[in-house]
């Protein structure tokens, strides 16, 4: 598998998409995890709901939220209140059984936000009543991974 | 009505290369995976493999890997069981089966079986 | 590999029998579990999945139960067109295993 680049922008939602065949993963939940090293484990973070004909609706753990369009074959992996610490390397997978396919190997880029450096009153803070997610635009700039590049930095 | 149809019954030699068939019909047969079962003599049934005929993804059973190849060719809804060089204990029967994902437990079981390929291999 | 072992390997019972035969896994499989009968000379016909649903035109006499390790197939009253031997097969991981199978004979 190729790895996908999605960069967000700290403090702000990321949106990772990972596209599959639909009629190939029928009926198999879905799930988001996290890579731990290089050739370590994929620790899930997030799978879809537990009825796969209910899958559309959006599950969150913490900060991150899964849905699936089964039928247009796209998971969407949404990334709330993006921090630095969100950086690295994830697996978007199928499930069947105790087994995963990987559908899409995602790198996770950080940005820092430009509004940092500038004094609090400067900044806009959303009110009680508006939700996150209507206050940030979700950015999303995905790339592939160049031939050479690595996801990890090398260990000695 | 879905179907799975195999090909006739085989009678090789050691050392012989064969290729036998299963041609699905009644269903989308690039929709559902198929597997290989090998059925020796009286005995059990033994997964061998499996192939999504709409991209050619295959997994083996590690007994079987590097001993078989499973193939699809989605424009004649066939899948294809092969062996370049049969041994005796290759003498069975091989049965094909649709593998379908039941959404309730997103696994997958064998819902059609083809009528099986008996390959009986003799010097 | 997941071993699975089905006890007993035979068993002879009369029409209007109840019985029951158990499955083994060798480690956890939730239930992911699939029941099948096979006649001689025929290919196998999946009765159960996911260890307690019955497929479509199997007859009610037939259930499946159990999770994790532990599985069971009952007949609740034998027909004549039951006798024949039954295989479990586990579908939680790969490679996908059978139990060894038990033969079902009229007493």
């Known amino acids: 598998h190729n790895t996908t680049v999605f960069q967000g922008v700290a403090g702000q939602s990321l949106q990772v998409s990972c596209p599959y065949d639909s009629m190939k993963h029928w009926g198999r939940r879905k799930a988001w995890c996290r890579q731990l090293g290089e050739k370590g484990p994929c620790q899930r973070v997030v799978s879809t709901h537990n009825l796969w004909l209910l899958s559309f609706l959006r599950r969150w753990n913490g900060s991150t939220a899964i849905t699936d369009d089964t039928l247009g074959g796209t998971l969407t992996i949404t990334l709330r209140n993006l921090q630095p610490h969100d950086a690295g390397l994830y697996q978007c997978q199928s499930l069947h059984g105790s087994e995963a396919d990987t559908l899409r190997k995602v790198l996770v880029e950080v940005l820092a936000d430009p509004l940092d450096h500038r004094d609090a009153g400067d900044l806009w803070f959303p009110g009680e009543s508006e939700s996150f997610e209507d206050a940030h635009v979700e950015h999303s700039i995905s790339r592939s991974l160049l031939e050479g590049e690595i996801p990890f930095p090398p260990t000695s | 009505e879905v179907q799975l149809v195999q090909s006739g019954a085989e009678v090789k030699k050691p050392g012989e290369s064969l290729k036998i068939s299963c041609k699905g019909s009644?269903?989308?047969?690039?929709?559902?995976?198929i597997a290989w079962v090998r059925q020796m003599p009286g005995k059990g049934l033994e997964w061998m493999g499996i192939i999504y005929p709409g991209d050619s993804d295959t997994r083996y059973s590690p007994s079987f890997q590097g001993q078989v190849t499973i193939s699809a060719d989605k424009s004649i809804s066939t899948a294809y069981l092969q062996w370049s060089s049969l041994k005796a204990s290759d003498t069975a029967m091989y049965f094909c089966?649709?593998?379908?994902?039941?959404?309730?437990?997103?696994?997958?079981?064998?819902?059609?079986w083809g009528q099986g390929t008996l390959v009986t291999v003799s010097s | 590999d997941i071993q699975m072992t089905q006890s007993p390997s035979s068993v002879s019972a009369s029409v209007g029998d109840r019985v029951t035969i158990t499955c083994r896994a060798s480690?956890?499989?939730?239930?992911?579990l699939a029941w099948y009968q096979q006649k001689p000379g025929k290919a196998p016909k999946l009765l159960i999945y996911?260890?307690?649903s019955l497929q479509n035109g199997v007859p009610s006499r037939f259930s499946g139960s159990g999770s994790g390790t532990d599985f069971t197939l009952t007949i609740s009253s034998l027909q004549p067109e039951d006798f024949a031997t039954y295989f479990c097969?586990?579908?939680?991981?790969?490679?996908?295993?059978f139990g060894q199978g038990t033969k079902l004979e009229i007493k």
């Open positions: 089966a649709r593998q379908r994902t039941f959404y309730y437990d997103s696994s997958d079981y064998f819902d059609y």
């Open positions: 009644g269903y989308s047969f690039t929709s559902y995976w």
């Open positions: 996911a260890a307690a």
């Open positions: 480690q956890g499989i939730s239930s992911w």
């Open positions: 097969q586990q579908a939680d991981s790969f490679p996908r295993t």
